[in-house]
């Protein structure tokens, strides 16, 4: 058993079929010896009295908010809350996996630069009786300050017959150098708890590893005299590091047809302009990459072509 | 530390070339050694990330945009930097600033050119012959070097008496390319803002 | 998924007592509290007693005579029926909630609860 945060603890459960469970011991916060009984959330039935009570927890029943009461008056509570290891693995029924990069996958993070900002963003069918807290650390031996918000309900999805929710959390590192190379990972912990169950989530990175730009801003087109092509041109987006000829981004540049099924014209280019042929009905996407560590595309910058 | 005499090269075009040929080489190599060593540790994930130029080098620092140098989180990194008086920083000497900075990489080109050397000479000895250092990436280390143009005591391979451990080596040389990956992004995106400026 | 089965019924004279066993079986841990129902013959199924980790709750009609107990190591809920009249006559369900009531209450309700056993006969003649 471990503390979570005042009066809340976790109790770890090694779960299999025939498994003892675990013996707790509560201890009522007082000075006073005699007259406490205790009692577990809203029940008034008296569960037993002293000052300790001690209970075996084997099920999610057995968890809940104790409460030490004398003369009707309330002492202390302690929130016991159950994470749950079956077959040695601590159970993942709060989050869904999202299978993004790979299996096993909860968290997701992204950043759109280099000053140590990230998103990080997990998914749940469950609505209601949740609660999320984040921890970051640059390193776990010597961990270095990583301030995080608070995680907010971002958007909700209808996947089938179910609702899905999607929570993210910003964090910013606490001194962080654009230019520097990292070689100890950022850890980004979050804390669930639904109702009774307690189930923790880890991710580990590198901030260049998932970095994603934002699109390319000012995205216009120029026609070229007695010609079908049309000069492309954009911007470096605002929210990327500074200075650009340092923080370089290359670009690609595609033409669509109005049909998905048309073939895609590409170009790769590291300047902020293009020569391409516009066809009618078709339009022009950008997007953008950092020019020397391969992470991911920003999303499309589009404009029609005519 | 004795710092190499600089005679940097008056246009930085061929540094640039030669810097984006080095982050190419060093991707692929990466690459290589990720699919050919698959059952070994070899992903960003599973190994240690050293770097063989700490306390040696502070290419970062020296290197570091002007735009930055106003950022404290920059300027208090923990490696030591060669630019200890903070004035020089502020008035940006910059033709010594880019001397300093040059040469920085150029001490770095040479320690990962001495690494690899005397790795690829283990590597060569393993009966299983299964992975060996390309040897465009060992080239492009030299012409950048070159283009550099600094003069420096060359540095003898490291040789070793006793059996090598090829498994240890094979780790070693992902864990060494994965750190010259990150230094080779460094030098490019160096080499872009100095040829910009 | 949870498996509940029921054990322990059969023909008892008026005045007299039978002990139900109720074994659970399968993802026990997710139990949040357990009860017993009964259903007597063209009558509705109604709620007998709960029990959730050391409380317990009864219906008004069995209060005092019924005791619901628990056995943690075995995973097996009891009731203990004592001086049982003809009224008590039915088939007696166990049950098990999967989902979690703050009010212990909540757990007297039919639709708490998640998993059923086949249920056992319970005869009580005059």
């Known amino acids: 058993i471990w503390e979570l945060k005042k009066d809340v603890y976790v109790v770890e459960l090694d779960w299999y079929p025939d498994a003892p469970g675990e013996m707790v011991v509560l201890t009522c916060d007082t000075p006073e010896e005699d007259g406490i009984t205790w009692t577990l959330d809203q029940s008034s039935e008296v569960l037993g009295s002293g000052k300790t009570l001690t209970i075996q927890v084997k099920e999610f029943g057995d968890a809940g908010q104790y409460t030490c009461h004398k003369g009707g008056e309330v002492l202390s509570h302690s929130l016991l809350l159950l994470h749950k290891k079956e077959d040695g693995i601590w159970s993942t029924d709060i989050l869904k996996d999202q299978k993004e990069p790979k299996n096993k996958t909860f968290l997701r993070c992204e950043a759109k630069n280099y000053s140590g900002r990230f998103t990080c963003w997990w998914l749940t069918t469950i609505s209601t009786d949740l609660t999320f807290s984040v921890k970051s650390s640059r390193g776990s031996s010597d961990p270095q300050g990583v301030t995080c918000g608070a995680a907010t309900l971002s958007a909700e999805r209808v996947r089938g017959d179910n609702k899905e929710y999607e929570y993210s959390v910003e964090c910013q590192e606490d001194s962080a150098c654009p230019a520097a190379e990292e070689s100890l990972p950022i850890e980004v912990m979050v804390d669930a708890v639904h109702k009774l169950k307690y189930e923790n989530y880890t991710s580990s990175f590198f901030i260049r590893d998932i970095i994603k730009p934002d699109p390319p801003k000012n995205l216009q087109l120029k026609p070229l005299k007695n010609s079908r092509q049309v000069e492309v041109s954009w911007e470096y987006p605002d929210t990327w590091s500074t200075p650009h000829s340092y923080f370089s981004l290359t670009f690609c540049v595609q033409v669509q047809g109005k049909s998905k099924r048309e073939k895609k014209d590409r170009v790769f280019t590291d300047k902020t302009s293009a020569t391409v042929i516009c066809r009618k009905n078709a339009s022009i996407s950008v997007r953008a990459q950092d020019r020397y560590y391969s992470s991911s595309w920003s999303e499309w910058a589009s404009v029609p072509c005519s | 530390r004795n710092l190499p005499v600089a005679t940097p090269d008056p246009g930085m075009f061929p540094c640039l070339h030669h810097s984006q040929n080095l982050l190419r080489a060093v991707s692929n190599m990466l690459q290589k050694a990720r699919q050919t060593l698959e059952f070994y540790p070899c992903t960003s994930e599973e190994i240690d990330h050293e770097d063989i130029t700490k306390d040696k080098t502070s290419t970062v620092e020296a290197c570091l945009p002007l735009e930055l140098t106003k950022n404290e989180s920059c300027l208090n990194s923990r490696e030591t930097s060669f630019i200890t008086n903070g004035s020089c920083l502020a008035s940006r000497k910059t033709s010594f600033m880019m001397a300093l900075c040059l040469s920085s990489i150029y001490e770095d080109l040479k320690m990962y050119q001495v690494e690899f050397k005397t790795m690829n000479a283990k590597l060569l000895m393993d009966p299983k012959r299964q992975i060996f250092l390309d040897q465009n990436m060992l080239a492009v280390i030299d012409e950048l070097m070159q283009a550099l143009n600094f003069n420096s005591e060359t540095v003898p391979q490291k040789s070793s008496l006793e059996e090598p451990d090829f498994y240890k080596t094979k780790i070693k040389l992902c864990i060494l390319l994965h750190a010259f990956r990150i230094r080779a992004v460094t030098i490019d995106r160096v080499m872009s803002y100095l040829n910009a400026s | 998924e949870v498996q509940l089965v029921e054990s322990g019924g059969g023909l008892v004279q008026a005045g007299g007592s039978l002990r139900l066993s109720c074994a659970s079986s399968?993802?026990?841990?997710?139990?949040?509290?357990r009860g017993w129902f009964r259903q007597a013959p063209g009558k509705e199924r109604e709620f007998v007693a709960a029990i959730r980790s050391g409380l317990t709750t009864y219906s008004d009609s069995v209060k005092g005579r019924f005791t619901i107990s628990r056995d943690i190591a075995k995973n097996t809920v009891f009731l203990q029926m004592n001086s049982l009249k003809s009224e008590d006559t039915a088939v007696y369900y166990c049950?098990?909630?999967?989902?979690?009531?703050?009010?212990?209450?909540?757990?007297?309700?039919?639709?708490?609860?998640?998993?059923w056993g086949q249920g056992t006969q319970v005869t009580v003649s005059s």
């Open positions: 049950a098990a909630a999967v989902n979690y009531f703050t009010d212990f209450t909540d757990y007297s309700k039919r639709d708490s609860y998640d998993y």
């Open positions: 399968g993802r026990t841990f997710s139990i949040y509290a």
